[in-house]
Amino acid sequence: SSSPTSSASSFSSSAPFLASAVSAQPPLPDQCPALCECSEAARTVKCVNRNLTEVPTDLPAYVRNLFLTGNQLAVLPAGAFARRPPLAELAALNLSGSRLDEVRAGAFEHLPSLRQLDLSHNPLADLSPFAFSGSNASVSAPSPLVELILNHIVPPEDERQNRSFEGMVVAALLAGRALQGLRRLELASNHFLYLPRDVLAQLPSLRHLDLSNNSLVSLTYVSFRNLTHLESLHLEDNALKVLHNGTLAELQGLPHIRVFLDNNPWVCDCHMADMVTWLKETEVVQGKDRLTCAYPEKMRNRVLLELNSADLDCDPILPPSLQTS
C-alpha cells in the first residue's frame, strides 16, 4: 500500500479506561483512543490488530495518518469519521484487513483532506454506489481522493451477492463523477472477468492503474484514449490472450505510459501478428522480452519477440462437409 508510515517513535498509548467515557465530547488535544497508539509529532494514530468493532469516536483532531488495520469493523456506516470538530487534517486512511463487508453511502463524508484511502483485503460484498461520493446526486461535490487502494476486496465465491462484483465496484467509482481527481487506482486480485466499458473514460486524471492478478480475458471494449496522464498500467497475471490493433494504437498514443504484461496466457496464432509487430517496435512495454506463448501447445514458452509471421498461423477451419466427427 502507498499509505504513509510514521517516522516518529514517540507514540503514547491510552489507558483502557478512556475508552468511551469521553466519546460524546470533543477530544482533548493530547487524548489517544483506547487500544490505539498516537504520535502528535507525526500526526499519526495507529489502532492496529486490536479487534476493534467500531471506529473510535475520540480520535484526536490533529490526526493526519490513521491506521485502522487488522480489526473487526464489519460495517462502515454513513459518517463513520464525522466528528465535531471535523478531522480536517486526515489525509491518509488505511482500513486494510479489517473484515469490512459493508461500506455505506457517505462513509467518508466530512473528511475534507482525505487523499489516500486503502480498503484492501476486506471482503466488500456490499459497497454502496455512494461510498466515495457521499450523495446520490448525478454530480457530487468533488472528492479530495487522489489514491484509492482496493486490492483483494472480492469476497470468497460462496459469500458473494447475486450481482456483478465488477459492476458494484465500478458504480462506486463513477457515482456523481466525484473521483475526477483520482490519480492512483489499485484493483489487483479481485477476480475481475471484465472491465466495464465506461470506467476509464470517467477517471481522466489517472496516473497509475493496477489491474494485476485478475481474470481479464480481453481489453477489446476498454478505451485508454482519454487517459493522457497515465504513467503505469499493470496487467500482469490476468487471462489476456492477445491485444488487438485498437488497444495497441491507444496505448502507443499515451505519452508517458509504461505497461506491464507479464504472466498472461498469450495465444500465438495468426491473431497475434499485430501484437508481435508492435512489441518489436514499442518502448512502452516493460520486460517485453519476458513475454511468452501459452498456446497452442506447439508454441508454449516461445518468446513473443522472437516470433515471425511464419510462426503465427491459424489452423484452417474446414467447411462442414469436410469435417470428421
Epitope: L73, D101, E159
Partner: nanobody, 122 residues
Amino acid sequence: EVQLVESGGGEVQPGGSLRLSCAASRRPFSSKTMAWFRQAPGKEREFVAAVRWIGGATRYAESVKGRFTISRDNAKNTVYLQMSSLRAEDTAVYYCAAGQAWGTKFTDYSDWGQGTLVTVKP
C-alpha cells in the same frame, strides 16, 4: 422469515466447556449478522457475541472475551458458540438471533430462536 434452532445446552461444572449450535433453516441473506444473547433468571437479555456471515468479523461482550468463541459455517448455515472456562454466572438461557446491524442491542436483531439452557454448577 428464517427459523433458528439452538442446540448443545446442558449442565456442566465450573471450568468446563460446551459448544452451542444455531442452525438456520436457510441462509438468511437479509440478515448479515448472527449473534448469541443470554438471559439469566430475573435478569435482562444480554449480548454475548456476534459474527458476520460474510467476512467473519466477530465481536464479544467484555464478560466473555477470551473464554467464548463464535464462529460460522456458511455451507451449513450454522453458527457456533464455543464456551470454555465456564462460571456459575454464565448460567442462562442462550438465544440465537439474526439481524442486519453490527450491533449489541436486542433491537438490532429481528429473528430469534427458542433458546437453549446452559447450567453451570458444581
